[in-house]
């Protein structure tokens, strides 16, 4: 409950806000959930708390975990959880689903792409923008405050857009990148019965106990903008939100990508610190549109280590 997923890349800055709303004057205490150890407020620490914000300057893969924030107002104490995952930098250009923020869609008239989470950082313009890892150049692209505007949007403008900026903390600079998909609304579209691309039905995924794992549910629904197209994960036939286990979270927002002109939607189930009991659960990837519902099931199994003599 009151848990928010946050993610970032190693050696970049990551700033996370406590998911409980309140006034900036409220005292907020931050703890490592597993150890209940208080997080320092002194800025000389690489990880420190600053009111409603938890700052990783810079982040390391080992910072991944669940953090507890307690917001203390004069009348109430409210608890929230920040589920943080820090990933290794990708060697190639490909940005995996689990690093993507929610998809935005645009049309000829409206083509603003906001840089996700930027409001949490102390940054100065201009932002750098990349599409599919290539720096954007040309008069069609205008970096304006915290968003990118594309003039005369065309279907080939669809793709993954990354914003890059510098966070400044006490004179020290830290790089931050964030990526989201941009889709272009196509008037000539159609919809199909959902086709689940991943996982395969009755698939089994090998996992290590104690490690983190991600399951991607990906389905295609037709061509062009879809009126209703949603994918979600269920655990033993129950909604994730009804399953009160903060280690298991479905990402906020769904990423839309176009594969061979098809409208496809992905959502990632993030499982932190895999436990034995997670292997007993049935994980259902559900894809739903106006044509109906399709379900693929995946289970987790313990990774077998092969010993070579």
């Amino acid at each position: 409950k009151f848990s928010k997923q946050s993610w970032g890349l190693e050696n970049e800055a990551l700033i996370v806000r406590c998911p409980r709303q309140g006034k900036s004057s409220y005292i907020v205490d931050w703890y490592y959930s597993q150890t209940n150890k208080s997080i320092p407020t002194q800025e000389r620490n690489r990880v420190f708390a600053s009111g409603q914000l938890l700052k990783f300057l810079p982040a390391e893969v080992a910072d991944s975990g669940i953090y507890t924030c307690i917001v203390r107002s004069p009348t109430f104490n409210r608890t929230g959880y920040a589920n943080v995952t820090i990933y290794k930098k990708q060697p190639d250009c490909n940005v995996p689903d689990y690093l993507m923020y929610s998809t935005v869609s645009g049309s000829e008239k409206n083509s603003k792409i906001y840089c996700p989470t930027i409001d949490l950082y102390n940054w100065t313009a201009p932002l750098e923008w990349f599409k599919n890892c290539q720096a954007l150049q040309g008069s069609r692209y205008k970096a304006h405050k915290s968003f990118l505007v594309i003039d005369n949007v065309m279907t080939d403008d669809a793709g993954d857009y990354t914003c890059k900026f510098i966070h400044n903390e006490n004179g020290a600079n830290y790089s931050v990148t964030a990526t989201r998909s941009f889709t272009v609304k196509d008037e000539q579209g159609f919809s199909l019965f959902p086709v689940i691309r991943a996982p395969a039905h009755n698939e089994t995924k090998e996992v290590e106990i104690g490690e983190n794992t991600n399951l991607t549910c990906s389905a295609c629904f037709g061509k062009g903008a879809q009126f209703l197209a949603t994918v979600q994960w269920q655990l033993n036939g129950n909604k994730i939100t009804d399953f009160s286990e903060p280690r298991i979270q479905q990402e906020e927002g769904q990423n839309q990508s176009f594969s061979n002109g098809l409208a496809c939607v992905n959502t990632v189930l993030r499982i932190a610190d895999v436990k034995e009991e997670d292997l007993l659960l049935r994980y259902d990837c559900l894809a739903l549109n106006l044509h109906g519902l399709r379900r693929h099931t995946i289970r987790l199994s313990r990774k077998h280590h092969h010993h070579h003599h």
Partner: antibody, heavy 117, light 106 residues
Framework: EVQLVQSGAEVKKPGATVKISCKVS????????MHWVQQAPGKGLEWMGR????????EYAEKFQGRVTITADTSTDTAYMELSSLRSEDTAVYYC??????????WGQGTLVTVSS | DIQMTQSPSSLSASVGDRVTITCITN??????IHWYQQKPGKAPKLLIY???TLRPGVPSRFSGSGSGTDFTLTISSLQPEDFATYYC????????FGQGTKLEIK
């Protein structure tokens, strides 16, 4: 002990405006949120809106949007609720209550507003 | 808008009885449900916040439970001073009170 003392009962004509005050003691009004709640005779509680007195940010329930204005004077630790274009169904007891973003902890004694021609 | 359905609207019970009042929301809310007691001519009083946290000074016979869309206030053994009207309040999205449950002496 935290106390919220509201202004006295009011009788208003339809179409008029009423402004109720709520003075907070043993508590700094800037430190929390101030909520206002309506209760018509024999009826349930209806949340009207809230203010963060430190910065003046307000949020109103859809039902009262456009007719209610909540303000706060941090120098006197007093909050105000103004309701305009009064009609007979606005006859009610109005409560101020302090709390955080999510709920109310301490309540005023209530102010009865009667709207009658 | 989040709708709250509180039931029953009225309830007759005797001293010593165990009583439960239910609130159902039309959408999943993050345990941001609170329970208030109101006596005639008085301001409401907060009993339980965040689903199940007892407010300091509130007797332990009051308890809250539930999650998602279904929430319950339980009074384990009714005392004479408990006869009043009870309201649930959701604050997941703005704030909405339930319709109230009037608890009367049988």
């Amino acid at each position: 002990e935290v106390q919220l003392v509201q202004s006295g009962a009011e009788v208003k004509k339809p179409g008029a405006t009423v402004k109720i005050s709520c003075k907070v003691s043993a508590f700094n009004i800037k430190d929390d949120y101030m909520h206002w709640v309506q209760q018509a005779p024999g009826k349930g509680l209806e949340w009207m809106g809230r203010i963060d007195p430190a910065i003046g940010n307000t949020e109103y329930a859809e039902k009262f949007q456009g007719r209610v204005t909540i303000t706060a004077d941090t120098s006197t630790d007093t909050a105000y609720m103004e309701l305009s274009s009064l009609r007979s169904e606005d006859t009610a007891v109005y409560y101020c209550a302090t709390g955080d973003f999510y709920a109310m902890a301490y309540w005023g004694q209530g102010t009865l507003v009667t709207v009658s021609s | 808008d989040i709708q709250m359905t509180q039931s029953p609207s009225s309830l007759s019970a005797s001293v010593g009885d165990r009583v439960t009042i239910t609130c159902i929301t039309n959408t999943d809310i993050d345990d941001v449900i609170h329970w208030y007691q109101q006596k005639p001519g008085k301001a409401p009083k907060l009993l339980i916040y965040e689903g199940n946290t007892l407010r300091p000074g509130v007797p332990s016979r009051f308890s809250g439970s539930g999650s998602g869309t279904d929430f319950t206030l339980t009074i384990s053994s009714l005392q004479p001073e408990d006869f009043a009207t009870y309201y649930c309040l959701q604050s997941d999205n703005m704030l909405t009170f339930g319709q109230g449950t009037k608890l009367e002496i049988k």
